[in-house]
Structure formats: C-alpha cells, structure tokens
C-alpha cells in the first residue's frame, strides 16, 4: 500500500484546513491508527492528534477543540483531519504516520500554508496646490502573508514608488503616488489596488484628488461700451474666475466708495439707472485659501448729448 497526501495545503486565515492522509491499501489491509504531528525544522515533533481504529480521536491539549475528523461517512483507511479556524502560527510542516496490518507503518509530510489577506489603508498626502513640484498625492499600505501587490489605477499622470518591510510571518508593502498638481486633476479618482492570493478579488480604495488653485480674474459686461450711457437700466459687471476651494468675490471702487444704489451680489455688480456718477475704476478682488487675484475695469458713462469720444480701459492684475 501507499499513503496519499498533498505536498502543500493552502488555507485562508480563519478557514478550516483539511490535512489529507489516505492509506491506499491492498485488499484485507487494515489501518490501526494514524498519528499526526507537527514537525517544523529545528524543533522536536509535537503530537497533534491520534486517530485510533478502536479508541477513536485523541487531540493534544494545545489543539483541543480545533482538530476533528471529517464528517461521516468516513473510510476506515482515511486518516485525514480537519484543523479548524487556521491561524498564522499553524503554518508549517505536518506528518501523518499510519500504522497498518499486515503491511506495517507508513509516513508522509505536508506543508500547511496560511494565507493572511491584507487590510489595506490609504493615506492622502499633504494638501495639493497648483504650482507645486512633484508632490505626494497618497500612500497605500497593505500587510499580509505572502506579501500583497499594491498598484494604482488612475487617469492622472504620476510616478509610483514602493517599499516592503518583512515581519516574522508577514510583509507590509507601501506604495506612494507622486504627481505635479494641476487644476485638471481636481475631482479625479486615484485608486489603490491590492492583490493577494487570499482575496477572491482585488481590494480597491479610491481617493478623490483636490488641487487648490485660483484662475486669473476678468470682468465681463463692458464688451459694448455704447450700452453704458446715462439712463440705461440693468447694467451689470460680472467677475469671472474659478478656483478650488471655490473663491469669494469682493467689489471696490478704486477712486472712491461704491456709488449709492450699486448692488453687490457675489461675483456680480448691479447698477441702478446709470448716471455720470457711476463712471470710475472698479476692482474685482477674487480670493480663496490658496491665493487671490484682482481685475479692474474703467467704466465711462456716456452722455448721448455730448459728442465726445469714448474710451474703455480694461486692466487685469494679479
């Protein structure tokens, strides 16, 4: 006869491991007992369990409640055992020794491999601002056994670097994603992808990029200067900019206070029926936590009864 077993049994942490040991005997042969032991190199054999044809199952106190025979029906030539709720410390070499009559004793070894799936974590880097050089956007760490694979999935252009730390029974892998921040990256997903043989599918953690920026400011509303004449109603100036975080707007008049009746509504400056008092230099001040910008325009309210030429100055400053 001969013993049938596996060279390697692989199980995920917390699952049950079946340690196979089947005696393929000739007709009339009987298995009297099967002794299981742990036989890691450098240490003496540690008895695990004894399956006796007459006395039944005996389990070492160290494995009490964790070693069982497979559920019935059982073949009397099957010396396999179940190791419940596998932990990392169970990883190692095991030996089954089968005592038979009349053929004698047989033994076989197998290696139990316990996969420890990673629990990845993603840590965003420092605040991203347009104009910075190469900056850490995020780092992703995953620890498991064997070492997990950590990659990135994103449309954003960047560079990655990885490092690994080996522990006694596992390895931690950290991958960093660096980029040169630009406003086009705002709201873009950056996904850490962790692969491991103990996972049914890749684990993904997504971080949404936030890049602080403030665009140049400009003022709209003076495109047709002929519309800015005495008595006109509904005249308005609108300040144009964009930013992250969203900017706030403030209107001032360079050559004095804002005339009475002029309404400030965020990025818009609304005028009452125009008079010559409304002529002047208006400044739109745009700001967010990242930066500030100014844009100024000159309003010249025309008197239709005057034949004087008209001139418009648009100045943008930051």
């Amino acid at each position: 006869g001969e013993l049938e077993t596996s060279d390697v049994v692989t199980v995920v942490l917390g699952q049950d491991a079946k340690l196979p040991c089947f005696y393929r005997g000739d007709s009339g042969e009987q298995v009297g007992q099967v002794a299981w032991a742990r036989v890691d190199a450098g240490e003496g054999a540690q008895e695990l369990a004894l399956l006796h044809s007459k006395y039944g199952l005996h389990v070492s106190p160290a494995y009490e409640g964790r070693v069982e025979q497979p559920p019935p029906p059982r073949n009397p030539l099957d010396g396999s055992v179940l190791l419940r709720n596998a932990v990392q410390a169970d990883e190692g070499e095991y030996e089954c020794r089968v005592s038979t009559f009349p053929a004698g004793s047989f033994q076989a070894r197998l290696r139990l491999r316990v996969l420890v799936p990673p629990l990845p974590s993603l840590n965003p880097g420092p605040a991203l601002e347009e104009g910075q050089g190469l900056t850490l956007a995020a780092s992703c760490t995953a620890e498991g056994s064997p070492a997990p694979s950590v990659t990135w999935d994103t449309e954003v252009k960047g560079t990655t670097s990885s490092r690994s730390f080996k522990h006694s029974r596992s390895a931690a892998v950290t991958s960093e994603f660096h980029l040169v921040p630009s406003r086009s990256m705002n709201g873009q997903p950056l996904t850490c992808v962790v692969s491991h043989p103990g996972l049914l599918q890749d684990q993904r953690i997504t971080h949404i990029l936030h890049v602080s920026f403030l665009a140049e400011a400009s003022v709209r509303g003076l495109e047709d200067q002929n519309l800015w004449h005495i008595g006109r109603e509904g005249a308005m100036l609108k300040c144009l900019s964009e930013g992250q975080p969203p900017p706030s707007y403030n209107w001032t008049r360079l050559d004095g206070p804002l005339p009475s009746g002029v309404r400030v509504d965020g990025d818009t400056l609304g005028f009452p029926p125009l008079t010559t008092e409304h002529s002047g230099i208006y400044v739109c001040h745009v700001s967010n936590e990242f930066s500030s910008r100014d844009s100024q325009v000159t309003v010249d309210v025309l008197d239709p009864q005057e034949d004087s030429g008209k001139q418009v100055d648009l100045v943008s400053a930051s």
Partner: nanobody, 122 residues
Framework: EVQLLESGGGLVQPGGSLRLSCAAS????????MGWYRQAPGKERELVSS????????SYADSVKGRFTISRDNSKNTLYLQMNSLKPEDTAVYYC???????????????WGQGTQVTVSS
C-alpha cells in the same frame, strides 16, 4: 506473549477515590495506545478512557470527564486510571486493553486483562 494485569479495585464510598494500575509485558510498551474499559452487570463493555503511546494525548467518555485521569509510565510499562468523585453508577469490572495494530503475527491483536472490580456503595 502479551500480558496485562490490572490491580487497585475495591469497595469505596460515593465521593471517594481509587487508582487502578495495569502492568503490561510482552510488547514494546511505549509504541501503542492503550485504554480502560468497564462493564457493569447486564450492560455492554464501554470505553472509559484511552491514551496515546507517548502519553500526551488522552480521551475520556463524557460520563467520566473531569473526574477520571488516565496516565502511563513508559519506564515501568504501567497504565493508570485515577478515579475521583466516584458515583454508584461507576460500579463495574474495569479492564485494561491494548490494541497492537502493527508488527509480526505473534503480537498483532487486541489484548485484554482479566479485570478488577470497582464497587461504589455506601
């Protein structure tokens, strides 16, 4: 020739203790699991406890768990059963048993001692 000789039985009051011994000869003692069985009048023989060849692995019937302790001294070729908190229902003839599954045809087999009587009564 394989021989098993039990001793240590007797009359004891409920709650008392006894220690049974089984002297073995005629085989490589430390190589084989051994067991204690008992048989009460009019009942079938039942396995009380068993122990691996090294003595590190043990098993007990639910009815004696926590009260009986099996052990063996391989240097003296002797098997023991320490019985505490004895009850009237423990009354039976106790047998020492060895089942030798491997070897030549002269030793392979299932061997029993002649038994020792344990009576628990007030």
């Amino acid at each position: 020739e394989v021989q098993l000789l039990e001793s240590g039985g007797g009359l004891v009051q409920p709650g008392g203790s006894l220690r049974l011994s089984c002297a073995a000869s005629g085989f490589t003692y430390s190589g084989y699991a051994m067991g204690w069985y008992r048989q009460a009048p009019g009942k079938e023989r039942e396995l009380v406890s068993s122990i691996s060849g090294s003595g590190t692995l043990t098993s007990y019937a639910d009815s004696v768990k926590g009260r009986f302790t099996i052990s063996r001294d391989n240097s003296k070729n002797t098997l023991y059963l320490q019985m505490n908190s004895l009850k009237p229902e423990d009354t039976a003839v106790y047998y020492c048993d060895v089942d030798i599954p491997v070897g030549d045809a002269t030793t392979v087999g299932d061997y029993w001692g002649q038994g020792t009587q344990v009576t628990v009564s007030s």
